[in-house]
Amino acid sequence: ESGYAQNGDLEDAELDDYSFSCYSQLEVNGSQHSLTCAFEDPDVNITNLEFEICGALVEVKCLNFRKLQEIYFIETKKFLLIGKSNICVKVGEKSLTCKKIDLTTIVKPEAPFDLSVVYREGANDFVVTFNTSHLQKKYVKVLMHDVAYRQEKDENKWTHVNLSSTKLTLLQRKLQPAAMYEIKVRSIPDHYFKGFWSEWSPSYYFRTPEINNSSGEMDPI
């Protein structure tokens, strides 16, 4: 989804130095949407570089991005959300490189929050719950969540569970007894909208009980 050329012959004709990526967030601030772009090369000299989006907008032809340190950012209600927009890196009036992007395909949800784990002694299981702001949204309402947990000593040995609800049950027998666990969750669009994983929620830490130990609710550490 990049650039403009006559026939495809100029497929990769833009200067690679200016390649960039973007993500959209819908209803991120009330009914306002946002679009965030950044250069893939952190060493690009961005002093005179601007970003502009044209097409698939309501009431206006083009919008300019605001520069916030090394990222470029728009917050607006003016995204049509149907059709492709042309996002260009510009120096003055000259376009250096452009991408044709449908903003509904680059959606990055907000990170889940309020992650917690409760141990149920009678059921010998752990109930994992979390919240997401998307339950209140009108567009990106349907998400797939990725819950990842690990024993704290196993630095890269994460177990992942995909789910569409905000509640998960982990069986005690699947976990090591008397161990400290870290758990976190992220989200990705799952109906019509496409895009990227959200940032991870803050991690929650819990300890599994000793075998035959009755510890009740799992407290955060």
Partner: antibody, heavy 118, light 111 residues
């Protein structure tokens, strides 16, 4: 100007295969997905599937899986639709169409008539 | 699959009069204010031509006598003042869910 030019009419025998081409011009080939739509004689329109020329990724109507294969060639800005094991019910006009957005079709080829007859 | 039912099947309207075509879907094709319904015109021997996308957005170059409205499961294409060149078959199409389906078509003729 933006154009999709399709290959000419084909007459095939039952059981044969046919490959229809659609050459894009007037825009950057990898910017837009290209789709195929079937119109049987005197009938309405039926979406077959689409291809993203940038990635080669495809999406098919379940009804046409196994019948249709979509491919693209970035060097010639051309997409192809191959129909296999042809039967009389495959007789139709086949259109390629550019997807201006998800998923509506803002530019259409002129159509390719495929006739299956023994 | 989402079924699109157009009505009427055919329509005869006097020149300069209003023509209205309806399209009903078997399930909602809207996500809040995003209405994934599109309208095409097809003349004999020609490919379809996009008129309206997103229920109400007029495609570039299409005369403004064409307009679209509706949401959820009920959509309408209106030709405010029928011209001779508008004689054609009109199709609606949804794009919320694969397979992307079309209505059966409405034939518009001059009365």
């Amino acid at each position: 100007q933006v154009q999709l030019v399709q290959s000419g009419a084909e007459v095939k025998k039952p059981g044969a295969s046919v490959k229809v081409s659609c050459k894009a011009s007037g825009y950057r080939f990898t910017d837009y997905e290209l789709h195929w739509v079937k119109q049987a004689p005197g009938q309405g329109l039926e979406w077959i599937g689409g291809i993203d020329p940038k990635t080669g990724g495809t999406a098919y109507n379940q009804k046409f899986k196994g019948k249709v294969t979509l491919t693209s060639d970035r060097s010639t800005s051309t997409v192809y639709m191959e129909l296999s094991s042809l039967r009389s019910e495959d007789t139709a006009v086949y259109y390629c169409a550019r997807s201006g957005g998800r998923w509506y079709f803002d530019v259409w080829g002129q159509g390719t008539t495929v006739t299956v007859s023994s | 699959d989402i079924v699109l039912t157009q009505s009427p099947d055919s329509l005869a309207v006097s020149l300069g009069e209003r023509a209205t075509i309806n399209c009903r879907t078997s399930e909602s094709v809207s996500i809040h204010l995003l209405h994934l319904m599109h309208w095409y015109q097809q003349k004999p021997g020609q490919p379809p031509k996009l008129l309206i996308y997103g229920a109400s957005n007029l495609e570039s170059g299409v005369p403004d006598r064409f307009s679209g409205s509706g949401s959820e499961t009920d959509f309408t294409l209106t030709i405010s003042s029928l011209q001779a060149e508008d004689v054609a078959v009109y199709y609606c199409q949804q794009s919320i869910k694969d397979p992307y389906t079309f209505g059966g078509g409405t034939k518009v003729e001059i009365k």
